[in-house]
C-alpha cells in the first residue's frame, strides 16, 4: 500500500509471523514508529517496533504466536497500520487491508544435508520451516549451485515444480568444492513471493579414482 511518499509491504510466513518493510521519502529523524496489526475476526492484536534498515526504510516482525501455530487462515483480513509518534500522539503513516494468504513468503528452507555424494553427482535434502499444512503439496522450489570461479548470480536456477525436498545434482566435477542453496514458494497468493535463499550448504565431490573414469 502506498500513502503519500511511503511504501508499505508485508508478507505472511503462513504460520505466526508477518514481516513488514516501510520506506518513506524524506526520512523521519528520531521518530518512534511501529506496525500495528488488527485482524477482522480474531480477539488478538499485535504491534512491533520498526527499526531502521537503511536511510529511509524500516522493518519489523509481527510475532503472532508460537512459531508453528496457525494464527491466520485464508479468510482473515488484517488491518495493518504504520504509526509514528508525533508529540504525544501516534500518526497513521500508512495503512493496508492485508490478506495473509495473498501475500505469502515462507521461511527459508532449513536442515540442508548431503545424503550421498559421488565424483559427478550429489544428492541433497532439506526441510521446509514453519509452513502451513494448508498448502498440502502445493509448493515449488528453486535451487542453485555455486561453482568455483562463479557468483551466485551467475548460477543457473533449477526449478522443482512440486513439493520435493531433495535434489540430485549431476554433471559435477570430481574433487571440487561447491555450495548449494534452495528456496520455496507456495503456489497460492496473488502477491506471494519466493522465500529467502537457505543458508548455503558446502560440499565437495569425491576425487576421481586413479586410472579410472567414474
Amino acid at each position: 500500500a502506498v500513502n503519500g511518499t511511503s511504501q508499505f509491504t508485508c508478507f505472511y510466513n503462513s504460520r505466526a509471523n508477518i514481516s513488514c518493510v516501510w520506506s518513506q521519502d524524506g526520512a523521519l529523524q528520531d521518530t518512534s514508529c511501529q506496525v500495528h496489526a488488527w485482524p477482522d475476526r480474531r480477539r488478538w492484536n499485535q504491534t512491533c517496533e520498526l527499526l531502521p534498515v537503511s536511510q529511509a526504510s524500516w522493518a519489523c516482525n509481527l510475532i503472532l504466536g508460537a512459531p508453528d501455530s496457525q494464527k491466520l487462515t485464508t479468510v482473515d483480513i488484517v488491518t495493518l497500520r504504520v504509526l509514528c509518534r508525533e508529540g504525544v500522539r501516534w500518526r497513521v503513516m500508512a495503512i493496508q487491508d492485508f490478506k495473509p494468504f495473498e501475500n505469502l513468503r515462507l521461511m527459508a528452507p532449513i536442515s540442508l544435508q548431503v545424503v550421498h555424494v559421488e565424483t559427478h553427482r550429489c544428492n541433497i535434502s532439506w526441510e521446509i520451516s514453519q509452513a502451513s499444512h494448508y498448502f498440502e503439496r502445493h509448493l515449488e522450489f528453486e535451487a542453485r549451485t555455486l561453482s568455483p570461479g562463479h557468483t551466485w548470480e551467475e548460477a543457473p536456477l533449477l526449478t522443482l515444480k512440486q513439493k520435493q525436498e531433495w535434489i540430485c545434482l549431476e554433471t559435477l566435477t570430481p574433487d571440487t568444492q561447491y555450495e548449494f542453496q534452495v528456496r520455496v514458494k507456495p503456489l497460492q497468493g496473488e502477491f506471494t513471493t519466493w522465500s529467502p535463499w537457505s543458508q548455503p550448504l558446502a560440499f565437495r565431490t569425491k576425487p576421481a579414482a586413479l586410472g579410472k573414469d567414474t
Partner: antibody
Framework: EVQLVQSGAEVKKPGASVKVSCKAS????????ISWVRQATGQGLEWMGE????????YYNEMFKGRVTMTRDTSISTAYMELSSLRSEDTAVYYC??????????????WGQGTTVTVSS | DVVMTQSPLSLPVTLGQPASISCRSS???????????LEWFQQRPGQSPRLLIY???NRFSGVPDRFSGSGSGTDFTLKISRVEAEDVGVYYC?????????FGGGTKVEIK
C-alpha cells in the same frame, strides 16, 4: 455524552502561577489526549501542548516550554494545566479539548467551556 | 512554525446568502503520509470552539451540509451555502500537519 468541565475563573498577580483543571466524563479518560488551547481577549487561538493521560506523556509548544506543566489524575479523570511566571499577556481564556490518541482525522473534537485567567497587579 | 492567514477579517452577510472564508498557510501542509490536516472551527459568541470540517473537506458529525471545505497545498476555503442566524460567530482554520499546530487569526461572520 462527552463532557469536559473546567475550573472557575482566576485572578492572579504577575509572577504568580495558575493551575486550571479539566474534568472529563462520558468516555474513557485514558484513551484520549487532552490538548490545551488559549485565547487572549479579542485574539485568536493558540495551541499550548497536550498530555496523554494513559501514560502521562506530555508535549509542549516551544513558546510555552519552561513555563507550562500538564499533569493528570486518572483516579478522578482530570487533567491540569499549570502556567507559571504569569505576565499580563497571559490574560486569556484557557480551553481543554479532547483529541484522539491516534491522529488520523482531527486534532480536537470536544472542548471544555473555558477558564478565564486574568493577570493583573 | 506554520502561519495560517485568514481573510477577510470580518464578513457581513445577508441571511440565506452564501459566504466564503479563505485560509492560506505559509507552507505546504500536506503531511508526509499524504493527508492534509486542515480543520475548520466555529466559535459562536460566548461559546467554546466547535469542530466543523476536518482533513480539508470532511464534515464532522452533526455539522449541517450547508458547510463545506475545499482546497489543497496552501490555499483553503470554507463555504456556507446559505447563511442562517445561528452561523454568526468567528471561524478559525487550523493546521495539524506540522507541530506546533497553529490556528488562523479568525474571520468574524455577522449578519448585515
Amino acid at each position: 455524552e462527552v463532557q469536559l468541565v473546567q475550573s472557575g475563573a482566576e485572578v492572579k498577580k504577575p509572577g504568580a502561577s495558575v493551575k486550571v483543571s479539566c474534568k472529563a466524563s462520558g468516555y474513557t479518560f485514558t484513551d484520549y489526549v487532552i490538548s490545551w488551547v488559549r485565547q487572549a481577549t479579542g485574539q485568536g487561538l493558540e495551541w499550548m501542548g497536550e498530555i496523554y493521560p494513559g501514560d502521562g506523556n506530555t508535549y509542549y509548544n516551544e513558546m510555552f516550554k519552561g513555563r507550562v506543566t500538564m499533569t493528570r489524575d486518572t483516579s478522578i479523570s482530570t487533567a491540569y494545566m499549570e502556567l507559571s511566571s504569569l505576565r499580563s499577556e497571559d490574560t486569556a481564556v484557557y480551553y481543554c479539548a479532547r483529541g484522539s490518541y491516534t491522529y488520523d482525522n482531527y486534532a480536537m473534537d470536544f472542548w471544555g467551556q473555558g477558564t478565564t485567567v486574568t493577570v493583573s497587579s | 512554525d506554520v502561519v495560517m492567514t485568514q481573510s477577510p477579517l470580518s464578513l457581513p452577510v445577508t441571511l440565506g446568502q452564501p459566504a466564503s472564508i479563505s485560509c492560506r498557510s505559509s507552507q505546504n501542509i500536506v503531511h508526509s503520509n499524504g493527508n492534509t490536516y486542515l480543520e475548520w472551527f466555529q466559535q459562536r459568541p460566548g461559546q467554546s470552539p466547535r469542530l466543523l470540517i476536518y482533513k480539508v473537506s470532511n464534515r464532522f458529525s452533526g455539522v449541517p451540509d450547508r458547510f463545506s471545505g475545499s482546497g489543497s497545498g496552501t490555499d483553503f476555503t470554507l463555504k456556507i451555502s446559505r447563511v442562517e442566524a445561528e452561523d454568526v460567530g468567528v471561524y478559525y482554520c487550523f493546521q495539524g500537519s506540522h507541530i506546533p499546530w497553529t490556528f488562523g487569526g479568525g474571520t468574524k461572520v455577522e449578519i448585515k
